[in-house]
């Protein structure tokens, strides 16, 4: 069976928009469907439609298509906002330029090159012809619009209304002529949707045929509309992923605008003595990297070959061998004249914000060079040079020593959650600093999000105990007790560590808490043989806003048939939508005669955007949250379940993908649960386990 082409790439999408017909004579056709792709395929093929389809609306709430013989530019029609609607207009009907020979052109130009009005295609006056709309179905020989139904050289044409001139081509420009860009096109927001070799671009909001990281909702400022060429990553010019499964991406043929000036909004603040932000506007003359090695000239290919040339990166001032940041790196850099060191950062250039004790950082703060030297817990930072041994223990590369001066907050290990420092306090060996991200900074902090295909499961198989897979075992489930009563759930992720929520700790006195492991009954009835009761020796609070706590046990749990650990997901991983997961807890059940036994509710993973819709748009989820909806209406976590896990299985391996936290009500029908996304904090968890001392068993 021939695989039907996906035609949604031929449409321009306007989110949260519908069309209302003012003229009652205009027809529309509706039908229940599952996806916008299905609507698009039918619109393109005009299958079963009593008109030529020019646009459609997909109603996400009702899962319905509305096909139209008109678009937003037609008369008798108005645009209207609607949360549940997405409008898709066939680009051929709204484009005012041609691609190639203009065979697909369906615009409304109706005047020839010399200015003569076109003859309607259905008329035989003044010229008789065989180009009847009925003979050229799908070629849109409507009214008297210029067309090229046979794809002839010269582009769209028409019979003219002048009896002396039978036909003439129309003066419709090539899209590649109309479209132009400044510099390397990072600010280009035009409508070019095919590559320089003519391949159609893949939509940015699609992951087929090519999976990629550039999701429109993750990069709202990059202009990822439809399938238009863009330059989000500092390439020499705009590009796109293609619909050809064998060509992942290609550049687009967009010429440089004659008046090559940038908009004010595109110009980074130019500085010559210091670095503002990531230093994209640095135009000074420093020409050595941090350790004094001279820079290679940008226009030279020796000793290192590269494509970061002044020709490829116009407007980036790649003069001489000066440090620059043409590609949105952490800070200005250059290729070096040492054949063994390809590139180096010029981190000796001071930060313009250096005078502020408490400023802000961009991205994950890897390049923060401020002079704050106090942690969020109020402890004074200790000198970096006293802690290099500890630092080497948990990073596997040589840190940039020029940045680690004094006891200032820094991020030498690429921590996703910002600058930190060592404290000299054995209770809190290191902690984050009270610096926030700069306002308006949208740099993603998860490096791995570049590869959304990253699996959450480590590749190992499910652990087997005594030859039987422990699939039914929930030995990692912890009952946290506060003053002898159950208060929260938790997950045993290591013999000495329990992952739970910060809302589970109403007291700072650790003597108020105990962890019960190996139990099924919240009161421990009948669990005497398997129950382990452990004191709590420390609470390590997660990064700012995480709501997570790592609870250190006074002694390690003994792993046996009733007590086991649960795996953590890979950092920054994505779990597919509709993956079946479970939440566990001893919390409020709504039952008067609750038996105290551990309960499970089955949920399935839901994408953040869809989740937000279920919350009526009142909730915007971010990269640190994960959403799961109930299979059974009105089931889900509640008070007493907080701190407990959202457990999912991938490649036969169970992992804690979410942590239950308060704040969204209990199991409200049609309101999916929002959990802390453990994958976002996995590196922090590993770093704590690695750097905090635990008692030996």
């Amino acid at each position: 069976q021939r695989k039907r082409r996906n035609t949604i790439h031929e449409f321009k999408k306007s989110a949260k928009t519908t069309l209302i017909k003012i003229d009652p004579a205009l027809k529309i056709k509706t039908k229940k469907v599952n996806t916008a792709d299905q609507c698009a395929n039918r619109c393109t093929r005009n299958k079963g439609l009593p008109f030529t389809c020019k646009a459609f609306v997909f109603d996400k709430a009702r899962k319905q298509c509305l096909w139209f013989p008109f678009n937003s530019m037609s008369s008798g029609v108005k645009k209207e906002f609607g949360h549940e609607f997405d409008l898709y207009e066939n680009k051929d009907y709204i484009r005012n330029c041609i691609i190639g020979k203009g065979r697909s052109y369906k615009g409304t130009v109706s005047i020839t090159k010399s200015g003569i009005k076109c003859q309607p295609w259905s008329s035989m006056i003044p010229h008789e012809h065989s180009f009847l709309p009925s003979s050229y179905r799908g070629k849109d020989l409507q009214e008297n619009y210029c067309r090229n139904p046979r794809g002839e050289e010269g582009g769209p044409w028409c019979f003219t209304s002048n009896p002396e001139v039978r036909y003439e081509v129309c003066d419709i420009p090539q899209c590649s002529e109309v479209e132009c860009m400044t510099c390397n096109g990072e600010s280009y927001r035009g409508l070019m949707d095919h590559t320089e070799s003519g391949k159609i671009c893949q939509r940015w909001d699609h992951q087929t045929p090519h999976r990629h990281k550039f999701l429109p909702e993750r990069y709202p400022d990059k202009g990822f509309d439809d399938n238009y060429c863009r330059n989000p990553d500092g390439q020499p010019r705009p590009w796109c992923y293609t619909l050809d499964p064998h060509t992942r991406w290609e550049y687009c043929a967009i010429k440089t605008c004659a008046d090559n000036t940038m908009n004010d909004t595109d110009v980074p603040l130019e500085t010559t003595e210091c670095i503002q932000g990531q230093g994209e506007g640095y135009r000074g003359t420093v020409n050595t990297i941090w350790n004094g090695i001279p820079c290679q000239r940008w226009d030279s290919q020796y000793p290192h070959e590269h494509d970061m040339t002044p020709e490829n990166f116009k407007c980036k001032d790649l003069r001489e061998n000066y440090c620059r940041n043409p590609d949105g790196s952490e800070s200005p850099w250059c290729f070096t004249t040492d054949p063994n060191i390809r590139v180096g950062y010029c981190s000796q250039i001071p930060n313009c914000d250096m005078s502020h004790g408490q400023d802000c950082y961009r991205g994950n703060g890897k390049n923060y060079m401020g002079n704050l030297s106090q942690t969020r817990s109020g402890l004074t930072c200790s000198m970096w040079d006293k802690n290099m041994e500890d630092l080497h223990r948990h990073i596997f590369w040589e840190p940039d020593a020029s940045k680690l001066n004094e006891n200032y907050c820094r991020n030498p290990d690429d921590d996703a959650h910002g600058p930190w420092c060592y404290t000299g306090n054995p209770l809190i060996p290191w902690d984050y600093c009270p610096i926030s991200r700069c306002e308006g900074d949208t740099t993603p902090t998860i490096v791995n999000l570049d590869h959304p295909v990253i699996s959450c499961a480590k590749t190992k198989q499910l652990r087997v105990v005594n030859g039987i897979p422990t699939r039914t075992n929930i030995g990692w489930m912890v009952s946290l007790r506060y003053r002898n009563k159950h208060i929260c759930g938790g997950s045993l992720i290591k013999e000495s560590w329990v992952l739970t929520a910060r809302q589970c700790f109403p007291s700072r006195d650790l003597k108020d808490y105990e962890a019960w492991l190996g139990i099924h009954d919240v009161h421990g009835r009948g669990d005497e043989k398997c129950k382990q009761v452990l004191n709590v020796s420390q609470l390590v609070y997660g990064p700012e806003g995480s709501d997570l706590v790592l609870m250190k046990l006074a002694r390690p749990a003994v792993l046996d048939d009733f007590v086991s650990t649960i795996d953590l997901p890979n950092y920054g991983c994505t779990i597919p939508e509709k993956t079946s997961c479970s939440v566990y807890g001893w919390g409020y059940t709504g039952l008067i005669n609750y038996d105290g036994l551990l309960r499970v509710a089955h949920l399935y993973i839901m994408g953040n955007e869809k989740c937000s819709q279920h919350h009526r748009g009142k909730v915007t989820l971010n990269e640190s949250e994960i959403c799961a909806g109930a299979e059974k209406i009105g089931s889900g976590p509640c008070e007493g379940d907080y701190g407990g896990p959202l457990v999912c299985e991938q490649h036969k391996m169970r992992m804690v993908l979410g942590v239950i936290v308060p704040g969204r009500g209990c199991a409200i029908p049609n309101r999916p649960g929002i959990f802390v996304r453990v994958a976002y904090y996995a590196k922090w968890i590993h770093k704590i386990i690695l750097t905090y001392k635990v008692p030996q068993s």
């Epitope: 408490q358 109020g378 402890l379 404290t423 809302q503 109403p506």
Partner: antibody
């Protein structure tokens, strides 16, 4: 981030008692401490005590033991403070204040205050 | 009880000037868990106090970066780098390390 709606002003006689209320919204009432703070006209702030609605736990400033009684009703997300044996010294504005749990332990949401006036 | 001593009681400043308020506690505010629970609040006339700085030096959300806090142990400082008209009011330091929680007597920031 949450809101606290306090009951209206009270005019009471010496020796009487008064019960003022504080209704919470926009956050999980049972998962934060509710504190009460006293402010006499032109004076500083004095901490009276706090209650953890999830468990009914209370801590009091020794100075207000026997004077203030803190209670909470989880079903209506409302905290109460009863002041007994009132004297002119008890005339003040009383604030209910949410205390965020660890790692913070700060007062991030304040009610608008309830004015209690004791006069014969 | 921990006594919080704030100085000065009144601080007349010109708009655009830097202002500095000191707060001293009668005992260390470092909790046994390593954290220092010293916070700063601002109360404008006729309003409830609002949180500015928590745990010595963390700016609360929405607080302008002209406010900064520093200090350790028993000595703490709140600095306003360039005073604006909206900053006028009474500033209180407060500790939540030891029960009962206690407040400083307040510093009134006013126009010179």
């Amino acid at each position: 981030q949450g809101q606290l709606q306090q009951s209206g002003p009270e005019l009471v006689k010496p020796g009487a008692s008064v019960k003022i209320s504080c209704k919470a919204s926009g956050y999980v009432f049972s998962s934060s401490w509710m504190n009460w703070v006293k402010q006499r006209p032109g004076k500083g702030l004095e901490w009276i005590g706090r209650i953890y609605p999830g468990y009914g736990d209370t801590n009091y400033n020794g100075k207000f033991k026997g004077k203030a009684t803190l209670t909470a009703d989880k079903s209506s997300s409302t905290a109460y403070m009863q002041l007994s044996s009132l004297t002119s010294e008890d005339s003040a504005v009383y604030f209910c204040v949410r205390e965020e749990l660890g790692p913070y332990w700060y007062f991030d949401v304040w009610g608008a205050g309830t004015t209690v006036t004791v006069c014969s | 009880d921990v006594v919080m001593t704030q100085t000065p009681l009144s601080l007349p400043v010109s708009l655009g000037d830097q202002a500095s308020i000191s707060c001293r506690s009668s005992q260390s505010l470092v909790h046994s868990n390593g954290n220092t629970y010293l916070h700063w609040y601002l109360q404008k006339p006729g309003q409830s106090p609002k949180l500015l700085i928590y745990k010595v030096s963390n700016r609360f959300s929405g607080v302008p970066d002209r406010f900064s806090g520093s200090g350790s142990g028993t000595d703490f400082t709140l600095k306003i780098s360039r005073v604006e008209a909206e900053d006028l009011g009474v500033y209180f330091c407060s500790q939540s390390t030891h029960v009962p929680y206690t407040f400083g007597s307040g510093t009134k920031l006013e126009i010179k």
